[in-house]
């Protein structure tokens, strides 16, 4: 970190990687919740035209696919993996790909994935061959 760039503000240390370099934020698709036509496919594109620089360097990309009796939605955001999202821990946040895993939610089918490469939540993967662990 160069000396002229403040290392600490209000005791909040700048995020650095393990060689001391400043951690730069990643890029994520960020359309919040949109209606989706993604259904019964091995993978889908988000169809989100908004790519944002995540606000915080520690944030990762997240996608949430939900289906109920009325519609299908896809949510794309940046989120801090230290914090739960929709009451679930982002256990796959270090993955370079967004591999969807089903979560238990009453009244709907709910899949979520997180990943840590640029725009990785643009391509969401449901295919079983990628899933090495059982859904929650």
């Amino acid at each position: 970190i160069p000396p002229h760039v403040q290392k600490s503000v209000n005791n909040d240390m700048m995020v650095t990687d393990n060689n001391g370099a400043v951690k730069f934020p990643q890029l994520c698709k960020f359309c919040d919740v949109r209606f989706s036509t993604c259904d019964n496919q091995k993978s889908c594109l988000s169809n989100c035209s908004i790519t944002s620089i995540c606000e915080k360097p520690q944030e990762v990309c997240v996608a949430v696919w939900r289906k109920n009796d009325e519609n299908i939605t896809l949510e794309t955001v940046c989120h801090d993996p230290k914090l739960p999202y929709h009451d679930f821990i982002l256990e796959d946040a270090a993955s370079p790909k967004c591999i969807m895993k089903e979560k238990k939610k009453p009244g709907e089918t709910f899949f979520m994935c997180s990943c840590s490469s640029d725009e990785c939540n643009d391509n969401i993967i449901f295919s079983e061959e990628y899933n090495t662990s059982n859904p929650d």
């Epitope: 970190i1 990687d17 393990n18 060689n19 370099a21 400043v22 730069f24």
Partner: nanobody, 122 residues
Framework: EVQLLESGGGLVQPGGSLRLSCAAS???????QMWWVRQAPGKGLEFIS?????????YYADSVKGRFTISRDNSKNTLYLQMNSLRAEDTAVYYC???????????????WGQGTLVTVSS
């Protein structure tokens, strides 16, 4: 030796415009991803814009989207930030920055200019 030198900062009224420049040397500028990062008084770093190379794709933080434009002139080894519709909350030191892999997976060296101060006030 990598050097990044920002210029173009100053005092501007709300609603005004400024164009920042960053002169780069010591590396192959035309192949590098470049960033503009700012630090408001008493605040942390805010990464506001990135431009890739090749291709020149540009990205913005929500706080500046639609108001700021990042660009580069590879023939002049210079990075630019055009700032329009400036607000008081844009007051900050603006840095240009680059990073390159260390060779160890997932880690980077980062390089920073000395910064240029932008003050938006009436």
């Amino acid at each position: 030796e990598v050097q990044l030198l920002e210029s173009g900062g100053g005092l501007v009224q709300p609603g005004g415009s400024l164009r920042l420049s960053c002169a780069a040397s010591g590396f192959t500028f035309g192949t590098e991803q470049m960033w503009w990062v700012r630090q408001a008084p008493g605040k942390g770093l805010e990464f506001i814009s990135r431009i890739d190379s090749p291709g020149g794709r540009t990205y913005y933080a929500d706080s500046v989207k639609g108001r700021f434009t990042i660009s580069r002139d590879n023939s002049k080894n210079t990075l630019y930030l055009q700032m329009n519709s400036l607000r008081a909350e844009d007051t900050a030191v603006y840095y240009c920055a680059k990073r390159r892999p260390t060779g160890v997976s997932g880690t980077f060296y980062d390089y920073w200019g000395q910064g240029t101060l932008v003050t938006v006030s009436s």
